[in-house]
């Protein structure tokens, strides 16, 4: 007789979970020398071990200490990009400009990215079919605790000038619920940053506005600023030749604003 | 080229009021934060207000019941209105642009015009 | 308000010197400090902010350092251009508060 089973409103666990995280760590820790130490088998014991056999809805930032200690990695911390809303342009930004790094360059990012997981409370069991969704379910869900947590420790070590890429295009181009706007922006320390700048993103191609006038972006701008944190804005009118830039910055066409 | 201009500076006998104007070119007071600087003759510099983009205002607590800052984003003018003027208010007053949007340091600054308070 | 102290208030040295002006805060101020040049009758000119960034178009011979409460401002080889008054300011709280200035001129 099948077990009864919790049906929830999100998708279930992404198909060979177990196998993509560990197969993503032993890449990972190939390409980067500085992470070669870690031992992947213990990684992915410390993943499952945050929400296996754990009620999917109870899920808190100490259940993923063990793992955060084993993927405990120091990148440079004046070289931090944010983003919201805009993962695929912030990726491309950093293949290109490889001193600089969004929370997917770093292992625990890496593993986790575009993945979802959950248990059940009192089995064993990967729960495949469904997992709680953020808004209909649950906030304390196994993937939204495990974004809060990394994202948190990501935003506390940076320093100098944090960069965050914006997406010009959404109706709210910095909004409070995202994870930057609810967890990122809040655990950046004033004590180690200087200045937050926003790059904001243009969708179109004869889109000439300034977006850094945007409401959200002066709220941004509010937030940052009542924490002793500069804030500077910018317009990226033309992603496409922004990247071509960053690519090759010596281009005669780069002088002008991109 | 940015440019910052002030002007309203004079001679002003104690308890009166002035107004100071800072006119700038080659950058928008909507992207930019403003602050008024003074110097009194021969001494060091005291920052005095800001004003940042979007209007809302910063002072120095020894100012703040006798000073406004204000600004006219349409004619590129950011204003120091000084009440109750006294012989220590004599110095130099800088307006200066914020070096980024929302920056506390001050990276082009006007040549001052010199407020003389004596009766 | 946060007090800057700098010192020296004057110095008189050779071109080509190496000049370094301190500046002390009563308080950690994370580096929240930028340097300023005045030459007579002039406005004050942002020379290095954050402690040890130096602006676009300055020259290299000035350099800064410092972290904590203590910060170091340094002209590694003095020039006749040089002569002036250097003041450091920190942002790190309003009122943003300026040292008193260290006056340098050429023995």
């Known amino acids: 007789v099948p077990r009864w089973r919790q049906q929830w409103s999100g998708p279930g666990t992404t198909k060979r979970f177990p196998e993509t995280v560990l197969a993503r760590c032993v890449k990972y820790t190939e390409i980067h020398p500085e992470m070669r130490h870690v031992d992947c088998q213990s990684v992915w014991d410390a993943f499952k071990g945050a929400f296996i056999s754990k009620h999917p809805c109870n899920i808190t930032e100490e259940d993923y200490q063990p793992l955060m200690k084993l993927g405990t990695q120091t990148v440079p911390c004046n070289k931090i990009l944010l983003w919201s809303r805009i993962k695929d342009l912030a990726h491309q930004f950093t293949q290109v400009q490889r001193d600089m790094f969004t929370l997917e360059d770093t292992l625990l990012g890496y593993l986790a990215d575009d993945l979802t997981w959950c248990g059940e409370f009192n089995t064993s069991k990967i729960n495949y079919q469904s997992c709680p969704d953020w808004r209909k379910d649950c906030s304390n869900n196994p993937v939204s605790v495990f974004w809060k947590t990394v994202s948190r420790r990501f935003a506390e070590a940076a320093c100098d000038v944090v960069h965050v890429m914006l997406n010009g295009s959404r109706s709210k181009i910095f909004d409070k619920n995202s994870t930057f706007g609810s967890v990122e922006v809040h655990n950046l320390q004033p004590e180690k940053v200087q200045t937050l700048e926003a790059w904001v993103i243009h969708g179109g191609r004869e889109d000439s506005r300034d977006l850094c006038q945007d409401p959200t972006i002066k709220e941004l701008e509010s937030i940052i600023s009542k924490r002793n944190i500069q804030f500077s804005c910018k317009n990226i009118y033309r992603p496409d030749k922004f990247l071509q830039c960053v690519k090759n910055p010596e281009d005669s066409s780069c002088t002008s604003e991109i | 080229e940015v440019q910052l201009v002030e002007s309203g500076g004079g001679v002003v006998q104690p308890g009166r009021s002035l107004r100071l104007s800072c006119a700038v070119s080659g950058f928008s007071l909507l992207s930019y934060g403003v602050h008024w600087v003074r110097q009194a003759p021969g001494k060091g510099l005291e920052w005095v207000a800001v004003?940042?983009?979007?209007?809302?205002?910063d002072y120095n607590a020894a100012f703040m019941s006798r000073f406004t800052i204000s600004k006219d984003n349409s004619k590129s003018t950011v204003y120091l209105q000084m009440n109750s003027l006294r012989a220590e208010d004599t110095a130099v007053y800088y307006c200066?642009?914020?070096?980024?949007?929302?920056?506390?340091?001050?990276?082009?600054w006007g040549q001052g015009t010199l407020v003389t308070v004596s009766s | 308000d946060i007090q800057m102290t700098q010192s020296p208030s004057s110095l008189s040295a050779s071109v080509g010197d190496r000049v370094t002006i301190t500046c002390k805060a009563s308080e950690d101020i994370y580096n929240r400090l930028a340097w300023y040049q005045q030459k007579p009758g002039k406005a004050p000119k942002l020379l290095i902010s954050?402690?040890?960034s130096l602006e676009t178009g300055v020259p290299s011979r000035f350099s800064g350092s410092g972290s904590g409460k203590d910060y170091t401002f340094t002209i590694s080889s003095l020039q006749p251009e040089d002569v002036a008054t250097y003041y450091c300011q920190q942002f790190w709280n309003t009122p943003w508060t300026f040292g008193q200035g260290t006056k340098v001129e050429i023995k």
């Open positions: 004003i940042w983009r979007g209007g809302s205002a």
């Open positions: 200066a642009k914020s070096m980024i949007t929302t920056g506390f340091t001050l990276d082009y």
């Open positions: 954050g402690a040890t």
